[in-house]
Every structure is written in structure tokens, then in C-alpha cells.
């Protein structure tokens, strides 16, 4: 069976693929696709934001390409960016550390 | 419950805490902590691929501060290469695609 | 209300390189926003250089990209081009601009425009 | 790099008109079309984003409409304060291109 990293990069690049597989470029996410995604997939990260404005900032924040779309380069990018803050938050709570050097 | 990509970022986290933790700096993976994180939890990355140089070469190109360790960041852009390498391998296969748009 | 004003020299003498700098006023100069620089040639249409904007993420345009410089001092709400090796063909009104995080990214926000003329 | 064609370069009408303004895009934009407006001797002002959406503060006398690689600016009822010169955008890939521009004039 394969190890827990492992099934995460495998959930990583499956969940891309079930939303940009829904319309336009079948390798990218357009905006529409991006916002079911998030909905869907990451509501502890969306929260309350769900107005369109913040869509849109959030969408241009990740288009470092400037085609409107995220390909799967800048969708890595972004879901690293989530990890980096669960680890700061992670970081923030010694107790629920691994043990101490 | 959370969501499978929610708990793929919480593995992530989880995993790179489970082993910077053993020796040194808690919050940094040295060389043999990445050397048990690759063997343990990324098998089918690494492979046959377990000689002293791969691995050398595998930490310098990892360490892009070249503080001989690696921190939470570095560690993310490792793990969103070998998802874009999932990713390639995923998109050459037409069959195994979400249907066509 | 945002404003942006372009500064730099308006004469640049041939082979030397152009420096120009534009002061956004009226809104923080936040990562939501790309900061361009387009230039209009004398009674001619108008061309996109390149941009700078989250992450300090810069593309140029191809044509421009080997003599081109972008950078941002976002402590002083500015953000700065420099094009090397000019000739007259460089002879333009350069404006800066903020492209929108609305689809299609448009230039929603034009300085007035400096002319900047390349003569020895 | 895609090509914006704007093919009429100058257009001549009456106060009051509807005018109507073209702009060919060489390949598909997916409907990511912007239009601008240059005064004499002034600035450019965004106009309508995204084909057919207003920009705040626009008259709504401007209205854009289009699809593909075909788009197009109406002016529904001319005022004087609209005689300038107007440019269309691609906002679909980089680099950003536009379009030559076509110049409004009175008759």
C-alpha cells in the first residue's frame, strides 16, 4: 500500500484533475473550476470568503502566467502556500510538537 | 471530516515534523533526517536510487539557502516537483483522464 | 483615488539606458495588483513592456526582454524600468499603468505619460 | 504573440449617431477584450473589461459585445465629449497587445 506522502501528492494531482477536467483546457483551471475546487476541496482554507472579489484576487494571485487559468505548476505553488501557514501554525504550538531536540 | 486534500496538506506537515524533530534543529531536516523521510515515506520516488552521491546531490539541489539543511519551504518545493512529475506522467495518459472537455 | 506619475529624464542619448520610475498614490501598493509599464510611439499605437506584481513575479515582453529591467520599492509605493542599449526606435511616450485582478486583467488605473525622446 | 486588427483607422460621424467600432483578434481571446479610450493629447481610460463589462464610472451610452476572435465597442448615442481615439486589448496571454486604434471624428 503506498505510504501517507505518497497518497497526499497522489490526492494532490487527482483532485487538479477532477476539476479541470470540467471545461475549456482539460490541464488547467479556469476561475469557475478554481472556486469549486476551493469549495469543495479546501473549506477550512475559503472560510466565509466566498465573494467574488476575493475570487478574483485570489485567482490573479495564483496566475503568475497571466492566461486567466491555473495550470498545475501554480496550483502547486498555491497549495504549498496553505501547507507553509499550517506549519506556522504548527510551529506555534510546542505541544503538539514531535519531541525536543 | 476533512477533505482528502485538506488531509494530503496535513500529511505534509505531519510527515516533515515527524522527522525534523529527531536531531538538531526541530524545525529543519538534516541530511539524514531527509535521508529516512525519502526512504520511509517516499519509496517509489527514490527506488534504487539510495548511493551516497544521489543523495548528496538530492540535499544540494533541495537546500536553495545552503544552510546544509532543509527547511519547511524547501521541503514543499521538493514535494510540488515530484507532484508535477506525478502530474506529466498523469496527463500522458489520455484514458486515465477526467472526460473530455 | 489612485494615481500614478511617471519621473525620469525625457532625453536619453543613443546606446545609454532609459530609467523611469513611477509613485503610486491614493492606494497601498498591494500584491493584488500587477504594476505595468506600455509605451506609445509618436502617433502610433501602443506597446505592453512588461509588469511586476505578486510575489515580485515579473514577465517582459519577448521583443524587449533582453535590455529590459523591472523592480519595485513597494517601502516608497514605486515601481522602476530600466531599458539598456536605447536608440531611436525607443523614442515613445511611456506610461505606467495598474492592471486589475478582474478577468482579462485590464489596465484599469494610467499615469499621464512621460515622452522620453533618444537623441545625441 | 497575438495580433489585434482594429481595420477601420479612422471613423467619421454626427452627434447623436450610433457608432459602432470592430477590433479582429488573430486567434481565440476567449472573450478577454478591453477597450481604451485616448482623448486628444490626454491619457487612456479603461472603458469595458472582460468584452461587455463597464468599467465604473463609464457612461452607459459604451457598451462591447463579441466572442471568439470578433469584438466590437458601441457608442449608442454620440456626444462631443467622446470624440477621441479608442484602442481594444487582448487580456487572454501575454504579451498584452492592442489594437492600432480607430479615431472617432465629427462629421
Known amino acids: 500500500m503506498a505510504c501517507p506522502l505518497e497518497k497526499a501528492l497522489d490526492v494532490m494531482v487527482s483532485t487538479f484533475h477532477k476539476y479541470s477536467g470540467k471545461e475549456g483546457d482539460k490541464f488547467k483551471l479556469n476561475k469557475s473550476e478554481l472556486k469549486e475546487l476551493l469549495t469543495r476541496e479546501l473549506p477550512s482554507f475559503l472560510g466565509k470568503r466566498t465573494d467574488e472579489a476575493a475570487f478574483q484576487k485570489l485567482m490573479s494571485n495564483l496566475d503568475s502566467n497571466r492566461d486567466n487559468e491555473v495550470d498545475f505548476q501554480e496550483y502547486c505553488v498555491f497549495l504549498s502556500c496553505i501547507a507553509m501557514m499550517c506549519n506556522e501554525f504548527f510551529e506555534g504550538f510546542p505541544d503538539k510538537q514531535p519531541r525536543k531536540k | 471530516m476533512a477533505c482528502p486534500l485538506e488531509k494530503a496538506l496535513d500529511v505534509m506537515v505531519s510527515t516533515f515534523h515527524k522527522y525534523s524533530g529527531k536531531e538538531g534543529d526541530k524545525f529543519k531536516l538534516n541530511k539524514s533526517e531527509l535521508k529516512e523521510l525519502l526512504t520511509r515515506e517516499l519509496p517509489s520516488f527514490l527506488g534504487k536510487r539510495t548511493d551516497e552521491a544521489a543523495f548528496q546531490k538530492l540535499m544540494s539541489n533541495l537546500d536553495s539557502n545552503r544552510d546544509n539543511e532543509v527547511d519547511f519551504q524547501e521541503y514543499c518545493v521538493f514535494l510540488s516537483c515530484i507532484a508535477m512529475m506525478c502530474n506529466e506522467f498523469f496527463e500522458g495518459f489520455p484514458d486515465k483522464q477526467p472526460r473530455k472537455k | 483615488q489612485v494615481q500614478l506619475q511617471e519621473s525620469g529624464p525625457g532625453l536619453v542619448k543613443p546606446s545609454q539606458t532609459l530609467s523611469l520610475t513611477c509613485t503610486v498614490s491614493?492606494?497601498?501598493?498591494?500584491?493584488?495588483?500587477?504594476w505595468n509599464w506600455i509605451r506609445q510611439h509618436p502617433g502610433k499605437g501602443l506597446e505592453w513592456i512588461g509588469h511586476?506584481?505578486?510575489?515580485?513575479?515579473?514577465n517582459y515582453n519577448p521583443s524587449l526582454k533582453n535590455r529590459l529591467s523591472m523592480s519595485r520599492d513597494t517601502s516608497k509605493n514605486q515601481f522602476s524600468l530600466k531599458l539598456s542599449s536605447v536608440t531611436a526606435a525607443d523614442t515613445a511616450v511611456y506610461y505606467c499603468?495598474?492592471?486589475?485582478?478582474?478577468?482579462?486583467?485590464?489596465?484599469?488605473?494610467w499615469g499621464q505619460g512621460t515622452l522620453v525622446t533618444v537623441s545625441s | 504573440d497575438i495580433q489585434m486588427t482594429q481595420t477601420t483607422s479612422s471613423l467619421s460621424a454626427s452627434l447623436g449617431d450610433r457608432v459602432t467600432i470592430s477590433c479582429r483578434a488573430s486567434?481565440?481571446?476567449?472573450?478577454?477584450l478591453n477597450w481604451y479610450q485616448q482623448r486628444p493629447g490626454g491619457t487612456l481610460k479603461l472603458l469595458i473589461y472582460y468584452t461587455s463589462r463597464l468599467h465604473s464610472g463609464v457612461p452607459s451610452r459604451f457598451s462591447g459585445s463579441g466572442s471568439g476572435t470578433d469584438y466590437s465597442l458601441t457608442i449608442s448615442n454620440l456626444e462631443q465629449e467622446d470624440i477621441a481615439t479608442y484602442f481594444c486589448q487582448q487580456g487572454n496571454s501575454l504579451p498584452r497587445t492592442f489594437g492600432g486604434g480607430t479615431k472617432l471624428e465629427i462629421k
Open positions: 499603468t495598474r492592471e486589475s485582478f478582474y478577468d482579462g486583467y485590464p489596465f484599469d488605473y
Open positions: 491614493g492606494d497601498s501598493f498591494t500584491n493584488d495588483y500587477y
Open positions: 511586476i506584481g505578486y510575489g515580485g513575479n515579473i
Open positions: 486567434q481565440d481571446i476567449r472573450n478577454y
